[in-house]
């Protein structure tokens, strides 16, 4: 194998071009200068190198930049990005949104890998907060991105960025995350009129408190059952039958199909049966007439 370490005569690469496409691993290693590669990274992506060949090119860059690649190289990594480890990426300082977009484009179609998560983390930390342009970019590539953040991380999202959020971006968020996002959304959309406001706020309502749901019930919003089923149980329980009827409008009939599921099931248990009967839906399980309801949580608070 020793004789293979020298570049064969006439094979030394003068530029990164398609003539390298059938170079074997050892030929790429011996015949491609790392500094040349770094200055012509933009050409690599135009050549359909195999994964084996990309491994060699990565190795050459690693030797040239042991402390981490400069952004001028990172921006043009192309498919070579798929060969990077999170440890490689932690050495980078990515400040340009264009660089981030270029690398996310390469990863399009893949799940969010540990490499991408590390890249985003480095980028956002470098910026100090998740600004609107960054959030726009991230949710465009990864609709579930917001829901992958912890409530603590979400607290750094400025209300102005909420305008970039689409309903599908929140599909996998849990109540703790929506608790953080809802007040931001409320602030972001506060100057909108009733019906427009509801359209925008609807997907965030899993973080809404009881008083906001009561206020919405006065605005003829006709909330659909899917949204209602995602509301916080503790926020739904204090609503009266009349308030739920107003909140759901024509969709109130859907309660029957959901009567065994939370939060509908728990809400039914808190209502008087004769109030439930006024809906005419055959909902069962309410408090029988003549029973007294004690709010133990109020008693504990007073004592």
């Amino acid at each position: 194998e020793v004789e293979k370490t020298a570049c064969p005569s006439g094979k030394k690469a003068r530029e990164i071009d398609e003539s390298l496409i059938f170079y074997k691993k050892w030929e790429l290693e011996a015949c491609v200068d790392a500094a040349l590669l770094a200055t012509q990274m933009d050409r690599v992506n135009a050549i359909p190198f195999t994964y084996e060949q990309l491994d060699v090119l990565k190795h050459k860059l690693d030797e040239l930049y042991p402390q981490g690649y400069p952004e001028s190289v990172i921006q043009h990594l192309g498919y070579l990005f798929l060969k990077m480890s999170p440890e490689d990426i932690r050495k980078w300082n990515v400040t340009s949104l264009e660089t981030l977009k270029a690398l996310l484009e390469v990863n399009k179609g893949h799940e969010m890998s540990p490499q991408v998560a590390t890249l985003i983390d480095r980028f956002v930390k470098g910026r100090g907060q998740l600004d609107k342009d960054t959030l726009d970019t991230l949710t465009a590539f990864y609709p579930g991105y917001l829901c992958s953040l912890s409530p603590e991380e979400l607290s750094s999202v400025p209300p102005s960025s909420i305008w970039a959020v689409r309903p599908q971006d929140l599909d996998t968020c849990d109540p703790r995350q929506l608790d953080v996002l809802y007040p931001k959304a409320r602030l972001a959309f506060q100057n909108m009129n009733g019906s427009e406001y509801f359209v925008k706020i609807q997907s965030f309502l899993g973080g809404a408190p009881t008083e906001d749901l009561k206020a919405l019930s006065q605005q003829n919003v006709s909330m659909d059952l899917a949204t209602f089923m995602k509301l916080r149980t503790d926020a739904v329980l204090p609503l009266t039958v009349a308030e739920v009827q107003k909140l759901l409008g024509p969709h109130v009939e859907g309660l029957k199909a959901e009567e065994r599921h939370r939060p509908v099931r728990d809400w039914i248990l808190r209502q008087r049966q004769d109030d439930l009967d006024t809906l005419g839906l055959g909902l069962q399980g309410g408090i029988p007439n003549g029973y007294l309801v004690l709010d133990l949580s109020m008693q504990e608070a007073l004592s």
Partner: antibody, heavy 118, light 106 residues
Amino acid sequence: QVQLVESGGGLVKPGGSLRLSCAASGFTFSDYYMSWIRQAPGKGLEWVSYISSSGSTIYYADSVKGRFTISRDNAKNSLYLQMNSLRAEDTAVYYCASVHKKPIFDYWGQGTLVTVSS
Amino acid sequence: IQLTQSPSSLSASVGDRVTITCRASQGISSALAWYQQKPGKAPKLLIYDASSLESGVPSRFSGSGSGTDFTLTISSLQPEDFATYYCQQFNSYPLTFGGGTKVEIK
């Protein structure tokens, strides 16, 4: 939309020649590497030949080396395969396919049948 | 690099979960693509990088694996999925295909 249309197939005697063409449209042909892939009746796929975007770098499978010549004309958005000294085992449907950035075949033509028989 | 697909053919019903495997003669990282070919038609790219779905391909198709063992799964077989499926490696030149797996109606 992307279209690749092959032509030039037909019946030829052993030792004869054929020239296949592939007309491309709907994408920037000069940015793409192009390939010929063949499929013998009832068999699997075999990568036959490969040409770089400018036409300067070429690959042939051992089974066709010295007999087949791949070429392209970027001005005409066309790919060609000149097949000489044809043998019975060259009988197959020949597909042209495009390669962009990764060595995978993202677009394929509908194929043209080459039958080598006496 | 040789690719061996198994089974070479299988019979299944609409709604079935179908799994096809592709084994490489040496490690190929995640450099594997899957194609679907219907009778009389050209192959169509389904999956690349072992698990990435090509744009426009239904989500019932999924790929997995790395190294030498790879799997193509159809979660709920549809009438239009009866076809022959091929794997292809792009870890090193020359590019090679598996022998194919024909999915037939039971």
